[in-house]
Interface confidence: low
């Protein structure tokens, strides 16, 4: 029998590596691509703030452009999911409905209620995994039925894996002309909706552009350059490269404008005829084990997202204190650092890796002792690569709740950032009310003479806030905090505890026999390191 | 039966404005995006921008040769289509014609009805 | 902005001969292609889209082909109504380009 198919886009905003859209085309007489925009779910489930608002229409229009291309359309239809799945499925006479499998509990519970209104209107649901690399559920069955909580178990049981399965091949006008199109009309009926429409604040300078396109663009362009891929590593990236070092792909593996087995395999190919290459887990496939790594154990650790009633997690007494948390959020800490990189992140949706470090520790362990809970959610709207488990896995990972173990280690918000950018350029550029403060005091502007103040033509504590806390005496009281909560609660400590150092602090390793490089998978190369 | 017809071409001094109309019906205007496309005489078609529909809350795209001197309105009380010509030079000499682009069956977002046209000259 | 290119500027054919109008975009278009035809001293009319669509009304003797870069207008059974000029658009990206057209002669 021949469907009739709805296919719902969630995640999965691309048509390269699209295994239920490919299924949705292979089975059917005629496929309905669909986009739900549920705003009510999207708000209070997703979080998603302004940018990631204009991020995610910018990807609808994108994914109208390209289905466009190959003679179908995107239909964007607003409402609640469920009854907009119950009405069209009648509408329409569907007999499947086809979507990504996701793992947040969020879309767990939604592909639930839609197998439910199947079984009620009598319509088959097929749910394929294409945002991670691996079927968590199977590396979840090979540890026993509990995920590995340790990087390097991680890897163990991806060995036994071998390679994750490959990309499945695009659609293509001829899979698209196999199947009747949507009917007259309807693709201007459901127009992906402009961003006054929905009453978002107009775009800021957000460098990013959604869709799947812009994000193979910038994926050729950055493995164009084989040398730089096979030579990527974590620590040597500094956060004022304005043009991120990093791939600068990230907001487009959340959204799933890009496939993430895509990339691994292209990265597979380089790596095999690169001569000296980075080794995982400092190296571009070996973050995207990080990746899989927080996506395995948040799919199956209940309250993954919380502190309490987590069982990896610390549970830790933080301050509540609503006025340090604003601050910290406006950019109003009175260190230029956190401050630019806190600027940098509202204006732009993005902040460096190294930038997270600093402004998530400076959060909680190692200045404003506020819980990694309440910098998640302030990540969750601002990041445009904003991802349920990496963002939580990350928070716990850098308030030393969980998975990390140098826990001693605080970044100095003057230091540090003075010492990946000595002359301040990052600072000059998202704080320019201290552009004309001279290096020397471009970090620590509260220490230059009120006459160098004023000719820097600012006054701290009038044109810019004094620091909030003496980092020295804040970050020496959270530390005997911490060093407590870790005694008082050693067996949760242990639990994800790692005797692999985490990719900040890996030390660059390189291959240097004449072997060449083989397409070994990632987990294998990893146990070498 | 769709129907498109274009005014208010005509003889114009260089650095001049003209204001041409393309009045509309046999279809719901309001559903359509509507375009501007002029043809230079014995030369070819040359897409000018056009207007969205009200879904997309009649927002418009040009091309870079008149964007900024070029504005494409539309009265939708009235279903009549307006393209506003500022600054006019004696390359923009041509027939100028109205276009519908079809929604996505009939025509594919092709410009699937046209106008007959209205010339216009610049000229000193 | 992408360019399509009409090779022949002047084509020459004779009644009930078929004859191809060939269409080259400079850049990936997929299938967002169509044809115009224009006749001496009228407006243009659809005769495609989508690179292969017949437009309601047009005669099955028009046939297009072709995906991302190259396209073809194939009139079989020519008549002689279809001396006119031929036009190909892409309407894949902005600012939407036409060919430079193809005048079809009747021999």
């Known amino acids: 029998m021949r469907h009739r198919t709805i296919h719902l886009f969630r995640k999965g905003l691309r048509l390269h590596d699209n295994p239920a859209l490919l299924a949705a085309l292979q089975s059917s007489e005629v496929v309905y691509p669909v986009y739900i925009l549920d705003r009510a779910f999207m708000t209070s489930s997703m979080h998603i703030g302004a940018l990631r608002w204009h991020f995610l229409l910018q990807s609808l229009e994108d994914l109208r452009s390209s289905l466009r291309q190959l003679g179908s359309c995107l239909l964007v239809i607003q409402g609640e999911y469920e009854s907009v799945v119950r009405d069209h499925v009648q509408k329409w006479n569907i007999t499947q409905v086809t979507l990504d499998a996701e793992m947040e509990p969020f879309y767990k519970e939604m592909e639930a209620n839609i197998r439910g209104l199947g079984e009620e209107l009598g319509f088959q649901v097929l749910s394929l995994m294409g945002h991670s690399l691996y079927n968590t559920q199977r590396i979840l069955e090979l540890n026993g039925g509990t995920p590995p909580l340790t990087y390097k178990r991680f890897l163990r049981i991806l060995s036994l894996l071998g390679d994750p399965e490959v990309p499945v091949r695009n659609p293509t006008a001829e899979d698209f002309q196999r199947c009747s199109p949507p009917e007259l009309g309807l693709a201007e009926c459901y127009g992906v909706p402009l961003p006054t429409d929905l009453k978002i604040p107009p775009e800021s300078i957000s460098p990013w552009r959604g869709g799947e396109s812009e994000g193979l663009q910038r994926l050729e362009q950055h493995l164009a350059d084989q040398g730089w891929v096979a030579s990527f590593t974590k620590p040597k990236t500094v956060p004022n490269s304005l043009l991120p070092s990093t791939t600068g792909l990230s907001p487009y593996f959340s959204t799933g404008c890009l496939s993430v087995r895509s990339f691994f395999y292209r990265l597979s190919n380089i790596y095999a005829q690169a001569k000296h290459h980075s080794l995982p887990p400092v190296s571009l496939q070996g973050q995207l084990l990080w990746r899989e790594f927080f996506y395995t154990v948040a799919s199956a650790t209940p309250n993954f997202t919380k502190m309490a009633g987590n069982p990896i997690c610390l549970q830790i007494r933080w301050y509540e204190d609503a006025e340090r948390l604003h601050k910290w959020k406006t950019a109003q800490t009175g260190f230029p650092w956190i401050d630019a990189i806190m600027t940098q992140l509202r204006q732009e949706g993005w902040i460096h890796h190294l930038a997270r470090h600093a402004a998530a520790c400076f959060l909680t362990r190692g200045d404003l002792w506020i819980s990694w809970e309440e910098g998640m959610k302030v990540f969750e709207e601002l990041l445009l690569d904003a991802d349920y488990s990496i963002n939580a896995g990350n928070w716990m990972w850098l308030s030393a709740s969980a998975f990390f173990h140098h826990y001693t280690r605080i970044f100095c918000p003057v230091r540090f950032g003075r010492r990946t950018d000595p002359e301040g350029q990052y600072i000059r550029k998202y704080l320019p009310i201290l552009k004309n403060f001279p290096s020397k005091y471009i970090y620590e502007p509260w220490t230059a003479s009120e006459e160098e103040q004023k000719q820097a033509g600012c006054i701290i504590g009038r044109d810019y806030p004094f620091p909030m806390v003496d980092h020295k005496e804040a970050s020496d009281h959270n530390l005997q905090l911490m060093k407590q909560a870790r005694e008082e609660q050693h067996r949760i400590a242990q639990l994800t505890r790692d005797d692999a150092d985490d990719p900040m602090e890996m030390k660059l390793k390189r291959d240097h026999s004449e072997e060449s490089f083989t397409k070994t998978k990632a987990a294998r190369m990893t146990e070498q390191t | 039966e769709v129907k498109l017809e274009e005014s208010g071409g005509g003889l114009v001094q260089p650095g001049g404005s003209l204001r041409l109309s393309c009045a509309t019906s046999?279809?719901?205007?309001?559903?359509?995006?509507m375009s501007w496309v002029r043809q230079p005489p014995g030369k070819a078609l040359e897409w000018l921008g056009f207007?969205?529909?009200?879904?997309?809350?009649?927002?418009?795209e040009y091309s870079a040769s008149v964007k900024g001197r070029f504005t494409i309105s539309r009265d939708n009380s009235q279903s009549i289509l307006y393209l506003q010509m500022n600054t006019l030079r004696a390359e923009d000499s041509a027939t100028y014609y109205c276009a519908r682009d079809g929604g996505y069956d009939d025509g594919g977002y092709a410009m699937d009805y046209w106008g007959q046209g209205t010339s216009v000259t610049v000229s000193s | 902005d992408i360019v399509m290119t009409q090779s022949h500027k002047f084509m020459s054919t004779s009644v009930g001969d078929r004859v191809s109008i060939t269409c080259k975009a400079s850049?990936?278009?997929?299938?967002?292609v169509a044809w115009y035809q224009q006749k001496p001293g009228q407006s243009p009319k659809l005769l495609i889209y989508?690179?292969?669509t017949r437009h309601t009304g047009v005669p099955d003797r028009f046939t297009g082909s072709g995906s991302g870069t190259d396209f073809t207008l194939t009139i079989s059974n020519v008549q002689s109504e279809d001396l006119a000029d031929y036009f190909c658009q892409q309407y894949s990206s902005y600012p939407y380009t036409f060919g430079g057209g193809t005048k079809l002669e009747i021999k």
């Open positions: 046999g279809f719901t205007f309001t559903d359509y995006y």
């Open positions: 850049q990936d278009v997929g299938t967002a």
């Open positions: 989508w690179a292969s």
């Open positions: 207007i969205r529909n009200k879904a997309n809350v009649y927002t418009t």
